[in-house]
Amino acid sequence: FYDIETLKVIDEEWQRTQCSPRETCVEVASELGKSTNTFFKPPCVNVFRCGGCCNEESLICMNTSTSYISKQLFEISVPLTSVPELVPVKVANHTGCKCLPTAPRHPYS
Amino acid sequence: FYDIETLKVIDEEWQRTQCSPRETCVEVASELGKSTNTFFKPPCVNVFRCGGCCNEESLICMNTSTSYISKQLFEISVPLTSVPELVPVKVANHTGCKCLPTAPRHPYS
């Protein structure tokens, strides 16, 4: 009915779209909840975050385990009162993902 | 402060976080604006979409050129009146990206 090769290609594509940790670039300032006058160079870093598809609409791809990766970045405060400082940051890195039910929404939220 | 080799690697990392086409998985039904009684198997496909960081907060990573990729998927209509059919779908694939100013927000929007 369907040729094996086509089914194989479809299945491989499907596997690649599944919920799993994927390399993503995250903006450090918003990640750390920094004030708008604080900037980082580079402003973004690559870490793994959960992404991809779940089989059912009621499920969402969520992290089940997280580690925190150590990075060093230049922090720049505006107005520029001092030389950019090399500061340590710890960025969340998703190490495990799962399709989980979306949190039940409160009718008044 | 840093040797040339380290600065080169830092720059390479920064380049990797920049606005560019990135492999992303998209949900076909919502992409094609299908009715809620039409499903695809697999429900998601991998294509390239613009993503990554821009140097300024006022800029957003946007697509400047797009191609359309043909994928073969099973289309399932509910209630199940016939056998799932293998159909070709064309999904937008971003081939060029640029950091562009965010659309000016209308005061009443």
């Epitope: 580079p42 870093v45 690559n46 580690s67 925190y68 990766i69 150590s70 990075k71 060093q72 970045l73 090399l86 500061v87 340590p88 940051v89 710890k90 890195n93 | 840093y2 380290t6 690697v9 830092i10 990392e13 920064w14």
Partner: antibody, heavy 118, light 113 residues
Framework: DVQLQESGPGLVKPSQTVSLTCTVT??????????WNWIRQVSGNKLEWIGY???????VSNPSLKSRISITRDTSKNQLFLQLNSVTTEDIATYYC??????????WGQGTTLTVSS | DIVMTQSPSSLAMSVGQKVTMSCKSS????????????LAWYQQKPGQSPKLLVY???TRESGVPDRFIGSGSGTDFTLTISSMQAEDLALYYC?????????FGSGTKLEIK
């Protein structure tokens, strides 16, 4: 000079909850870019990281202990606390608090010994 | 979790001899964007808490004698004592600070022959 001093009950009974305190002097625990850690050392000299509380109050714990521990702080007293629930003889160790500047543990306390016995 | 494997577990050396101990991690400790290895070495003398010797795999902490030399990158690291002194009798631990949960090696016990 930065100093860390741990204190605790010393002896607890199995299944009880224990609370350990780390008092920091010479440095504010809310100073940016420092994380305040709990580390334990069992009799075989094995060092095990328990978790930290950050300068902003966020906590991260070792998944192997996560369900049994809680790390909190009192910024007015410049103290951090470790609460360990349902203790067993496997929790017998010297408990250290240590400061982390994002790269390494630069200051350690002298440690407090926890003994679990009925 | 990142597993840290130290070897040997103990070694007995004479004063003045060169001492070498190894530490291997189960994954790379090289962090971007600064391209530093998040590996530290600590010395623990009997009855004391651990003391930092080396960080970023090869940067000596201030006040640490220059006979302590850290080297390596990625997953393979070494601590060398160029000329052992009697006061170096201690336990030596490597520790990864790359990602939580932070993990330590099981230690190398240095004894005097």
């Amino acid at each position: 000079d930065v100093q860390l001093q741990e204190s605790g009950p010393g002896l607890v009974k199995p299944s009880q909850t224990v609370s350990l305190t780390c008092t920091v002097t010479g440095y504010s625990i809310t100073n940016r870019y420092h994380w305040w850690n709990w580390i334990r050392q069992v009799s075989g000299n094995k060092l095990e990281w328990i978790g930290y509380i950050s300068y902003s109050g966020d906590t991260v714990s070792n998944p192997s202990l996560k369900s049994r521990i809680s790390i909190t702080r009192d910024t007015s007293k410049n103290q951090l606390f470790l609460q360990l629930n349902s203790v067993t003889t496997e929790d017998i160790a010297t408990y250290y608090c240590a400061r982390d500047g994002g790269i390494y543990f630069d200051y350690w306390g002298q440690g407090t010994t926890l003994t679990v016995s009925s | 979790d990142i597993v840290m494997t130290q070897s040997p577990s103990s070694l007995a050396m004479s004063v003045g001899q060169k001492v070498t101990m190894s530490c291997k991690s189960s994954q790379s400790l090289l962090s971007s964007p600064n391209q530093k290895n998040y590996l530290a070495w600590y010395q623990q003398k009997p009855g004391q808490s651990p003391k930092l010797l080396v960080y970023f795999a090869s940067t000596r902490e201030s006040g640490v004698p220059d006979r302590f030399i850290g080297s390596g990158s990625g997953t393979d690291f070494t601590l060398t004592i160029s000329s052992m002194q009697a006061e170096d009798l201690a336990l030596y631990y490597c520790q990864q600070h790359y990602s939580t949960p932070y993990t330590f090696g099981s230690g190398t016990k240095l004894e005097i022959k």
